[in-house]
């Protein structure tokens, strides 16, 4: 029999302790929010918010400008000064709760925990390849706002998610805020609202539409808004909230809320429960039928998918899919299975399920006892009746009221439990060639770049490396700038190439040359590297 090279075990062909140094910026405090801007003329910027300060960085992560956003009441607060002579509210630190772009102007909008959660608008001024912020405009009109009715009170200190949508020649802010009794009483942000920026940038239009947790439920029913995004004709919010208004408030589950992006109204507000499970190939005795539930969403991102994953999900290449990282509970503590699981929900399927749920509620024959739901937002009612009413009147439509769809959308872990003990804290999905890659940040400050495929019993790593020595958790929000992703960990912002930080973690030539084409790996004497790292012979075709 011919002698053959001994086969190197797959795990031995790579080394995840290899150090990669990626560009970074020290913000001087815990990073609270981050957003990127790319103009049409090669100008770009990264905006990084920490307590009481907003940094403007160039594409190279070098500081371009810095702005004091607090403390409120401090004479040095530059944003506060835009609201004229104070005092405007109780003094205190400003934690940035919202940092979004209004691309039409273009402008950056920042909203903080101080000054009733008001926002500031900063016009963007391109200067070469960098961007500067113009003097802020205060989006607050004192005479239009009261504690019980405050169109300019946007951010909640408990957390707020905003997605900006352009409709015609106007910008609408789709806002979702976590509330409790104290916050609701002090400056009345709403749970979910659609607000329109006034044309003179003096605040938000007074007649905005909103839903809010009813006062009687504010103490016991808390909604965390994890993610928001806009795709197609809808804006979506992802929430973690108690499964029931009446039962144990610690029994949480995840919901998707859908709002129209073309009509700024809330009559067609819909919610759907997302169910993510770990279903091991061989079920242990006593394990639950259908798999172990992972009801709590930790992070999410939506992206179009590559050909291979699209085939596995039975959808077309390029279709938008919502990816979520789920854990078993709020603390994400160890259970029987892995710490984190990843589920994929095709957006078209989500929309179909929602539309079918509306038909079940509103088209006769309606199943008796089918509830409209959302009892924390509206009076209880049965389909097809409007909230709080016993019957439909001739001039009302069943479809013009918020609805919780009666069925849930169930998926299983794409990674088959292979994330194991890893606690994922950040997620961004990209399509590279025909490959779909999940870029994940972890609780211990690492980045995992892994191909999203379903059918394997091992993970296909692009990379797995530590961002630095601090080991601090990677934060939830990730931004993209060109071919890089920006991750925040502790007081640092890191710039990670989408194609991976390098190839040195591939130890064997065979493994090196089998790396994805987009990584640009080749064998370089006795190591795997990219061509720019290789002064000598660089080989992509065959091993020596």
């Amino acid at each position: 029999e011919d002698w053959q090279c001994p086969r190197t075990p797959y795990a031995a062909s790579r080394d995840f302790d290899v150090k990669y140094v990626v560009p970074s910026f020290s913000a001087g405090g815990l990073v609270q929010a981050m957003v990127t801007y790319e103009g049409d003329r090669n100008e770009s910027a990264v905006f990084v918010a920490i307590r009481n300060r907003l940094h403007v960085l160039g594409p190279d992560l070098k500081s371009v400008q810095s702005l004091a956003t607090g403390p409120a009441g401090d004479p040095g607060c530059q944003t506060c000064a835009a609201c004229g002579p104070g005092p405007h509210g109780p003094p205190g630190d400003t934690d940035t709760k919202v940092l979004v772009l209004d691309p039409a102007l273009p402008a950056l909008v920042s909203c903080g925990s101080s000054l009733q959660g008001r926002c500031f608008l900063h016009d963007l001024e391109p200067q070469g390849t960098a961007v500067h912020l113009a003097a802020p405009a205060c989006l607050f009109s004192a005479h239009h706002n009261r504690p019980d009715d405050c169109p300019d009170c946007v951010a909640s200190p408990l957390g707020t998610r905003v997605t900006v949508v352009e409709q015609g020649q106007a910008s609408y802010f789709y806002v979702a805020s976590s509330l409790d009794a104290a916050v609701a009483a002090s400056f009345s942000p709403r749970s979910v609202s659609i607000r329109r920026l006034k044309a003179d940038a003096s605040g938000f239009a007074p007649g905005f539409v909103a839903l809010s947790v009813l006062p009687k439920h504010l103490v016991s029913y808390s909604i965390e808004y994890v993610h928001s995004f806009h795709t197609g004709a809808f804006v979506y919010f992802l929430t973690v909230q108690p499964a029931s208004v009446t039962d144990d408030p610690s029994a949480l589950h995840t919901r998707l809320a859908r709002l129209s992006a073309t009509e700024p109204e809330l009559g067609d507000y819909r919610e759907l429960v997302l169910d993510c499970r770990f279903a091991p190939k061989r079920r242990r005795r006593g394990a639950p039928e259908g798999g172990q539930p992972y009801p709590v969403l930790r992070v999410a991102h939506s992206a179009p998918v590559g050909a291979q994953l699209a085939t596995e999900l039975s959808i077309a290449e390029g279709q938008e899919v919502l990816f979520g990282v789920f854990v078993t509970g709020k603390d994400g503590g160890p259970g029987v299975g892995p710490n984190s699981v990843v589920c994929a929900f095709p957006i078209d399927l989500l929309d179909t399920l929602i539309d079918e749920g509306v038909e079940r509620c509103c088209e006769s024959p309606v199943h008796p006892g089918l509830r409209r739901g959302l009892d924390f937002f509206q009076s209880p009612s049965f389909c097809p009746n409007p909230p709080g009413l016993e019957a439909l009147s001739p001039n009302t439509s069943c479809r013009h009221f918020p609805l919780l769809v009666s069925s849930s959308f169930s998926r299983v872990d794409l990674f088959n439990g292979l994330l194991g003990p890893v606690q994922v804290t950040a997620l961004y999905v990209t399509r590279l060639d025909n490959v779909t890659v999940a870029h994940m940040g972890t609780m211990d400050g690492r980045i995992l770049q892994v191909e999203l495929v379903r059918s394997l019993n091992y993970l296909l790593y692009v990379s797995n490396f530590s961002l630095g020595d601090s080991g601090q958790p990677v934060q939830r929000d990730v931004s993209r700038l060109g071919d890089h992703l920006l991750f925040a960990s502790g007081d640092q912002v890191f710039q990670v190439p989408i194609q991976g930080p390098g190839c040195r973690h591939f130890l064997t030539c065979g493994r090196c040359l089998r790396a994805w084409h987009f990584m640009g790996c080749g064998w370089c004497g006795n190591m795997c590297g990219q061509q720019k790292e290789c002064p000598g012979s660089w080989q992509q075709d065959h091993c020596p």
């Epitope: 039409a104 352009e166 015609g168 020649q169 044309a199 239009a205 905005f208």
Partner: antibody, heavy 117, light 111 residues
Framework: QVQLQESGPGLVKPSETLSLTCTVS????????WNWIRKPPGKKLEYMGY???????YYNPSLKSRITISRDTSKNQYSLKLSSVTAADTAVYYC???????????WGQGTLVTVSS | DIVMTQSPLSLPVTPGEPASISCRAS??????????MNWYLQKPGQSPQLLIY???NQGSGVPDRFSGSGSGTDFTLKISRVEAEDVGVYYC?????????FGGGTKVEIK
């Protein structure tokens, strides 16, 4: 100071395509909305359409099958094409900028286009 | 499309005196607590200039003597003390629904 200047032929034959260009100075067409409006003799001002900062377009449904608005960001210009013109398309054509809600705060001086053989 | 009707068609004015122009929309042009009504002045030989946006907000550089009011379907442009340079054609425009539509114009001239 923001300035807009229309340019293009003043005379177009029926059934041909009317082409106008608006050159912008003092602002970038990669922010805001860039509109075309016309005023036929003896009629109301008529809103034709816009191209946005991102290149998105909106066209008045009454013209939709005939109108195209495009842009050249490198020259900071945007253009109007109106096909299959008739005498009813004779008008003064204006380009104008809006930042919000179709409130047009800067206008070109207007150019008269006559459709005649 | 929303039809905008202006009155009067022609308005002879005396310098120093007030003047007022009306505009009526064929349907309500309010939404979100905002009235989507703009006013323009086209002086002789010039292009239109924005006077008032969102019913009552003054355009940049517009003299204080110009003011706008109204809501729903009925709107008014007022000139508190007319000056000779205010002559020209005044247009109202709604921007609540697309396409935006204009009134037929009111010609203001000195008596």
């Amino acid at each position: 100071q923001v300035q807009l200047q229309e340019s293009g032929p003043g005379l177009v034959k029926p059934s041909e395509t009317l082409s106008l260009t608006c050159t912008v100075s003092g602002d970038s067409i990669t922010s805001g909305y860039w509109n075309w409006i016309r005023k036929p003799p003896g009629k109301k001002l008529e809103y034709m359409g816009y191209i946005s900062y991102s290149g998105k377009t909106y066209y008045n449904p009454s013209l939709k099958s005939r109108i195209t608005i495009s842009r050249d960001t490198s020259k900071n210009q945007y253009s109007l094409k109106l096909s299959s013109v008739t005498a009813a398309d004779t008008a003064v054509y204006y380009c104008a900028r809006s930042k919000y809600d179709y409130a047009m705060d800067y206008w070109g001086q207007g150019t008269l286009v006559t459709v005649s053989s | 499309d929303i039809v905008m009707t202006q009155s009067p068609l022609s308005l002879p004015v005396t310098p120093g005196e007030p003047a007022s122009i009306s505009c009526r929309a064929s349907e309500i042009v309010d939404n979100f607590g905002i009235s989507f009504m703009n006013w323009y002045l086209q002086k002789p030989g010039q292009s239109p200039q924005l006077l008032i946006y969102a019913a009552s907000n003054q355009g940049s550089g517009v003299p204080d003597r110009f003011s706008g009011s109204g809501s729903g379907t009925d709107f008014t442009l007022k000139i508190s003390r007319v000056e000779a340079e205010d002559v020209g054609v005044y247009y109202c425009q709604q921007s609540k629904e697309v396409p935006p539509t204009f009134g037929g114009g009111t010609k203001v001239e000195i008596k």
